[in-house]
C-alpha cells in the first residue's frame, strides 16, 4: 500500500508542495489522515497527520468545546493507494480575525498562542490579546494548554493559549480518537504564562494558604515554587497557594484513547505505520458547528483537485 505522508503543525507541513508518498510496511492495510482544528476568539489553527495506519476504513468527525475553545476533529482511513488526501486542510479566514477592533474589550487580557510553536509560546513571549465577549459568551478567563494529535505512529502537539469562559478550570480536557485538547484556566491579567503545574483543589476542600503575620511592616512570605498566581478583585491580602509536591502532573502529555470507542466510530488510530515524512507546520481543518461563523467551514472538505491548468 502507498500512502501520502505529512505532518502539519499550524500552517505548513501538509501544504501543497510538501506532500510525500510512502510505501507502507507489511500488514499495513489502511492510509490515515487525521486533522484537529482549534479555534479561539482570536484565531484558529490545525494539526494534521497523513501516513500509513492500521485498523479499519471509515470516517470519524467530532466537534468539541472546552470553555469556549472550539475544536473539531476529523479522521479518515481508507484502503486504496494514496487515498488519504480527502480532508480539507485549508484554513478559512476567521471572522473576526483582523477585525477585532469592532469588538468591545471586556477588560481581561491573556497571552495568545494560535498556531505558534512551543519555542514561540514560552512564558511571556507570545502576543497579548484583549478578551471580548463573542456569540453571547463571556470570555474573561485565560487558558494555557496543548492540542495533541496522534495518528500513523506520529504525535504532533502545539501549545494553545487564549481567552476562555472559565477562570478556574484545572487540567480540563476534551478528547476525540487520538486527539486531545487540554489545559488549565486562570483569572487575572496575563495569568496564563505557565499553568502546567496548576494544582487541582476540590471545591469542598479549601486550599492550604500561608497567612501573613499580623503586621504591615514586614512583607508577606511568598511560596518560591509557585508558578500559578491567584489574583483577587477585592482589596484583601494576596496569598500564595502551597502546592502539594505530588500534584505535578502536566497537561502537556496526551491522553490515551479508548480504542474500543474508536472502533465503534468506524475508524481506528491504533497500531503502527510505515515511515512518515514531511515537516512541521500548515492549514486548518473544516467543520465545527458553533459560533456565528459557521459558513466559513466547508463541512468535511475534499481534495482540491485542480479543475484544469493554465492561465
Amino acid at each position: 500500500l502507498e500512502c501520502y505522508s505529512c505532518v502539519q503543525k499550524a500552517d505548513d507541513g501538509c501544504s501543497p508542495h510538501r506532500m510525500k508518498t510512502v510505501k507502507c510496511g507489511p500488514g499495513v492495510d489502511v492510509c490515515t489522515e487525521a486533522v484537529g482544528a482549534v479555534e479561539t476568539i482570536h484565531g484558529q489553527f490545525s494539526v494534521a497527520v497523513r501516513g500509513c495506519g492500521s485498523g479499519i476504513p471509515g470516517k470519524n468527525d467530532r466537534g468539541l468545546d472546552l470553555h469556549g475553545l472550539l475544536a473539531f476533529f476529523q479522521l479518515q482511513q481508507c484502503s486504496e493507494d494514496r487515498c488519504n488526501a480527502k480532508l480539507n486542510l485549508t484554513l478559512r479566514g476567521l471572522n473576526p480575525a483582523g477585525n477585532e477592533s469592532a469588538y468591545e474589550p471586556n477588560g481581561a487580557e491573556c497571552y495568545s498562542c494560535v498556531g505558534l510553536s512551543r519555542e514561540k509560546c514560552q512564558g511571556s513571549m507570545p502576543p497579548v490579546v484583549n478578551c471580548y465577549n463573542a456569540s453571547g459568551r463571556v470570555y474573561k478567563g485565560c487558558f494555557d494548554g496543548n492540542v495533541t494529535l496522534t495518528a500513523a505512529n506520529v504525535t504532533v502537539s502545539l501549545p494553545v493559549r487564549g481567552c476562555v469562559q472559565d477562570e478556574t478550570c484545572t487540567r480540563d480536557g476534551v478528547t476525540g480518537p487520538g486527539f486531545t485538547l487540554s489545559g488549565s484556566c486562570c483569572q487575572g491579567p496575563r495569568c496564563n504564562a505557565d499553568l502546567r503545574n496548576k494544582t487541582y483543589f476540590s471545591p469542598r476542600i479549601p486550599p492550604l494558604v500561608l497567612l501573613p503575620p499580623p503586621t504591615t511592616a514586614a512583607p508577606s512570605t511568598r511560596a518560591q515554587n509557585s508558578s500559578s498566581t491567584t489574583s483577587t478583585a477585592a482589596p484583601t491580602t494576596t496569598t500564595s497557594i502551597i502546592k502539594p509536591t505530588t500534584a505535578q502532573a502536566s497537561h502537556t502529555s496526551p491522553h490515551e484513547m479508548d480504542l474500543e470507542v474508536i472502533q465503534e466510530e468506524g475508524a481506528s488510530l491504533s497500531g503502527g505505520a510505515a515511515g512518515h515524512g514531511g515537516t512541521a507546520g500548515h492549514g486548518g481543518a473544516a467543520g465545527h458547528q458553533d459560533r456565528s461563523n459557521m459558513e466559513k467551514y466547508p463541512g468535511k472538505g475534499g481534495a482540491q483537485i485542480p479543475a484544469k491548468g493554465g492561465s
Epitope: H17, M19, K20, G93, G115, P306
Partner: antibody, heavy 117, light 112 residues
Framework: EVQLLESGGGLVQPGGSLRLSCAAS????????MSWVRQAPGKGLEWVSY????????YYADSVKGRFTISRDNSKNTLYLQMNSLRAEDTAVYYC??????????WGQGTLVTVTS | QSVLTQPPSASGTPGQRVTISCTGS?????????VHWYQQLPGTAPKLLIY???KRPSGVPDRFSGSKSGTSASLAISGLRSEDEADYYC???????????FGGGTKLTVLG
C-alpha cells in the same frame, strides 16, 4: 473561472524598488497558498516566494531573501511582492501562481520587471 | 544550474512517443516528494500538465503521462502532435532549499 492578474512591473534602476500585485478571482483566495515564480528572458522557471493561506507561513528563495517581501490581503483577494534593492539579475517575468493539490494549478499572465541602469 | 536536471532539448515526429527525464536528489524527488510537470507554450504562462507524479488535471489529454522512481521522474508524450511543441518543466519540493524547485526545462520540437 479562476483568474490571476499581475500588475506593477516596469523599468527600474539597480537598487530601486517595485511592488507587484496579483488580483485573484474565481476561487476562495483566503483558502489558497500562493507563490511568486519568475522567468528571466530566455531562461527557465525559478520559484521566488511562497505564502500560506493565512499569511503566517512564508518561504523565500535564497536569491531574494532579505530583499523581497511577500504578503497578502485576503479581504482584497490580492497577493503582493515588495521588491527592494533590485539587481540586474532580478530582471524577469514575474508570475503569481495558486497552489492546488501539491502543484501550481493556475498561473497569471505575468508582469515584466526590468532592472537596468 | 537547476536543482532538478532535465535534458535541454528533445524532439520527435508527429505520432511518435517522446520521453523527458527529470533527475533529482535525496533532498527532493528521492525524499519522497511528489513531482509535477508544467507545459509552457511559446509566449504564454506555464500550465499544469501532470501533478502528483502521474495525475492529469481535467482537460489534459491522456497522451501525457508521468512516472517516478527513486530520485528520477519522467514525462511521456505519445502520439506527438505539432501543438505539443513547448517547454516542459518538472518541479518538486526540496528539503534543503525549503521550497519548490524546477528543472531547467526541456524544449520539445516536433519535426516535420
Amino acid at each position: 473561472e479562476v483568474q490571476l492578474l499581475e500588475s506593477g512591473g516596469g523599468l527600474v534602476q539597480p537598487g530601486g524598488s517595485l511592488r507587484l500585485s496579483c488580483a485573484a478571482s474565481g476561487f476562495t483566495f483566503s483558502n489558497a497558498w500562493m507563490s511568486w515564480v519568475r522567468q528571466a528572458p530566455g531562461k527557465g522557471l525559478e520559484w521566488v516566494s511562497y505564502i500560506s493561506s493565512s499569511g503566517s507561513t512564508i518561504y523565500y528563495a535564497d536569491s531574494v531573501k532579505g530583499r523581497f517581501t511577500i504578503s497578502r490581503d485576503n479581504s482584497k483577494n490580492t497577493l503582493y511582492l515588495q521588491m527592494n534593492s533590485l539587481r540586474a539579475e532580478d530582471t524577469a517575468v514575474y508570475y503569481c501562481a495558486r497552489e492546488g493539490l501539491w502543484a501550481f494549478d493556475w498561473w497569471g499572465q505575468g508582469t515584466l520587471v526590468t532592472v537596468t541602469s | 544550474q537547476s536543482v532538478l536536471t532535465q535534458p535541454p532539448s528533445a524532439s520527435g515526429t508527429p505520432g511518435q512517443r517522446v520521453t523527458i527525464s527529470c533527475t533529482g536528489s535525496s533532498s527532493n524527488i528521492g525524499a519522497g516528494y511528489v513531482v509535477h510537470w508544467y507545459q509552457q507554450l511559446p509566449g504564454t504562462a506555464p500550465k499544469l500538465l501532470i501533478y502528483d507524479n502521474n495525475k492529469r488535471p481535467s482537460g489534459v489529454p491522456d497522451r501525457f503521462s508521468g512516472s517516478k522512481s527513486g530520485t528520477s521522474a519522467s514525462l511521456a508524450i505519445s502520439g506527438l502532435r505539432s501543438e505539443d511543441e513547448a517547454d516542459y518543466y518538472c518541479a518538486a519540493w526540496d528539503d534543503r532549499l525549503n521550497g519548490p524547485v524546477f528543472g531547467g526545462g526541456t524544449k520539445l520540437t516536433v519535426l516535420g
